[in-house]
Interface confidence: medium
Amino acid sequence: SERCDDWGLDTMRQIQVFEDEPARIKCPLFEHFLKFNYSTAHSAGLTLIWYWTRQDRDLEEPINFRLPENRISKEKDVLWFRPTLLNDTGNYTCMLRNTTYCSKVAFPLEVVQKDSCFNSPMKLPVHKLYIEYGIQRITCPNVDGYFPSSVKPTITWYMGCYKIQNFNNVIPEGMNLSFLIALISNNGNYTCVVTYPENGRTFHLTRTLTVKVVGSPKNAVPPVIHSPNDHVVYEKEPGEELLIPCTVYFSFLMDSRNEVWWTIDGKKPDDITIDVTINESISHSRTEDETRTQILSIKKVTSEDLKRSYVCHARSAKGEVAKAAKVKQKVPAPRYTVELACGFGAT
């Protein structure tokens, strides 16, 4: 067989669909691998071929497009299931070819079961809402292309297991769900069930997403350095371990990169010769504000180390801050016992 550009198994596009529901799956070649679309390919005389490998099998086989009621069909660059069955799970390949050109890619399709409360192994998209920020909406995702605009589906929204009706601050508005004022108590899984008719049959589309209420940009502040601070002095004798934590609070900011770093005498620890280790830990509040701690450690501090400047720096989209730690050498206490003993003429 002639050479075919094989893009392999595209695990980045692990597709999950619910059992017994319609699914439309676009060939990933045109979305992610090729620089032209299906229409261009079709008009250039290229043909799109589909085949699949069943779960736990090695054999590639053609897809049966002659099932009753056209359960599986292809339309342009889309593979349709009306509806899916559990044993449709497998790796699907779409191949674009003519006598001189060939390109193909495979992708995994998993058909998953859900219970009556919409729980399933499905990976859920997360939608972030700002706390106490005014009206915000989520939209029932991935339902475009399933029915024509002339069809008016019915949409029912659920929070967890419960149908959303007469909720205080959550109002269903067709494909949208409006949150009048988002609160921590609105965290959870929200499901829309879209019901539509097609050729005398009724189909259901179930879409679940996770709502996470996060800190509002109205409340966002530049990073706050809790430690080091003016109340704490790191007073050490040479040979002792020096531990200085830098603990920084970051307000939640969408797509902000939070950074914490130490400088010693104005240089990054990697750029100096002293034996420094830095350990980092991160924790989050319920609204995804972040507290980062970087502990600077010098196992056996020298008197030279105790004269250096240790500065903790932090940066977010809201600004940059820095704070120096107060480090000093401990003054040895006078040895009163010996001096007093001598003074009293002890032998």
Epitope: V221, V224, H226, S227, N229, H231, V232, V233, Y234, E235, L243, I244, P245, T247, Y249, S251, S281, D289, T291, T293, I295
Partner: antibody, heavy 123, light 112 residues
Amino acid sequence: HVQLQQSGPELVRPGASVKLSCKASGYIFITYWMNWVKQRPGQGLEWVGQIFPASGTTYYNELFEGKATLTVDTSSNTAYMHLTSLTSEDSAVYYCARTDFYRYDGGYALDYWGQGTSLTVSS
Amino acid sequence: DIQLTQSPSSLSASVGDRATITCRASQSVSTSGYSSMHWYQQKPGKAPKLLIKYASDLESGVPSRFSGSGSGTDFTLTISSVQPEDFATYYCHHSWGIPMYTFGQGTKLEIK
């Protein structure tokens, strides 16, 4: 999860001294202030002092200066309070309590508490 | 030092009642954006438990019937509908500035 486990009850003679312990787990011990709070039977809460484990920096309620000494052992994540020259007035339950971290620069609340150690000073 | 005065020192309520405890500081414990006033609940033989921090922030896991308000020198803890498990002693606590923290003298909430 955060836990503060305090040492067991103590019965000591007047004039003696005692060292109470508070073992922390479930968080980065050196990065949070550790406080000690006294509660006499049937009375309210009285702040004794606090220590920052990373540096050993301490602050005391002036009423307990010379009475209480706060120390830590960072290798075992344990805070200690040493009480000296004990009298019946020192009989109380002593709690260790961690300060939280919050967005604000200072003024922390006591978010986790040990179960308390009962100290009885009696001859 | 800042003194805290709680009132009343004891309060009788029935299940379902609304209960209000106030705490007055001898000087302001607020600055721009927050107040260093916190509320704790203590049951006999148990350690205090943080309910409200920074005057109005409900601590994680605390029922929403508890709420806090106030700024400057006057603060309030409110239980909107007292439940059987709420009968306990309540303390206000300020942590304004280092190095001195103080507590109110406590308010005992009793069954009527």
